[in-house]
């Protein structure tokens, strides 16, 4: 899943998502997350896994919304 690269490193929150993952990431693998920039042409929630991979996901997907709600509350 591609995100726009940044001179500040691969996980800088100004990245934009162009495609989304087609699979549900296991919750226990997620270490961190952020929302892509409001100026991006497509929405995106980027989950960062414990292995350091950043994965673009669609905020409209229910599992993404569930994960965000869970992480916000905990």
């Amino acid at each position: 899943t591609k995100t726009e690269s940044s001179s500040r490193g691969p996980y800088h929150p100004s990245e934009c998502c162009f495609t989304y993952t087609t699979y549900k990431i296991p919750r226990q693998r997620i270490m961190d997350y952020y929302e892509t920039n409001s100026q991006c042409s497509k929405p995106g929630i980027v989950f960062i896994t414990k292995r350091g991979h950043s994965v673009c996901t669609n905020p409209s997907d229910k599992w993404v919304q569930d994960y965000i709600k869970d992480m916000k509350e905990n």
């Epitope: 929150p13 997350y33 929302e35 409001s38 929405p43 929630i45 919304q65 916000k72």
Partner: antibody, heavy 122, light 108 residues
Framework: CQSLEESGGDLVKPGASLTLTCIGS???????AIWWVRQAPGKGLEWIA?????????TEYATWAKGRFTISKTSSTTVTLQMTSLTDADTATYYC???????????????WGQGTLVTVSS | DVVMTQTPASVSAVVGGTVTIKCQAS??????LSWYQQKLGQPPKLLIY???TLASGVPSRFKGSGSGADYTLTISDLECADAATYYC??????????FGGGTEVVVK
Amino acid sequence: CQSLEESGGDLVKPGASLTLTCIGSGFDFSSNAIWWVRQAPGKGLEWIACLYGGTSGSTEYATWAKGRFTISKTSSTTVTLQMTSLTDADTATYYCAGGVVTWSYPRQLYLWGQGTLVTVSS
Amino acid sequence: DVVMTQTPASVSAVVGGTVTIKCQASQSISSWLSWYQQKLGQPPKLLIYSASTLASGVPSRFKGSGSGADYTLTISDLECADAATYYCQSNTAVHTYNFGGGTEVVVK
């Protein structure tokens, strides 16, 4: 013309419960978010809760508001805020506000009611 | 929770002058930021959203900028009617929707 109007503000004693009501006119509750925001006398704005997501009715609460405040959609044009165990610190003007939903989440608040005053005092 | 810190708490300027208000989030909010204006005895009014987009009917004298965790509201060609308190708010999906503490603008 869109508008929101709050009601239910009152003078109550500490420990009491109170329900505030927000009625919308010309406002699409199903495609927008509804927020409750409060402002203590002479102080800043403090968000309490919001309800969004159309039929799914997702809700979010400020950390401090969880458990004591409940936001609910009671009809196609009405949203309520139930408040329990009120204290002096809850004395404020309570605003109902309409917010845009962008990319599945509530964003900016573009429509505000005039507010309703809640006073908690013994 | 994301903490929104506004500076200064109060600022004074003359008619025709310029005022700059800063809003700093405790972590990046990816330009998901709104600015509101509140006059005494009135509800707040949306000025700017997505950090830099003017709300409908808001004059271009109001300008929002910034990214990451740091944002600025600049009001140029100040008018008496701009005397108010200004608030920023985080609107990102992944954090709480907290407001800044507010900045009072006094126009002389």
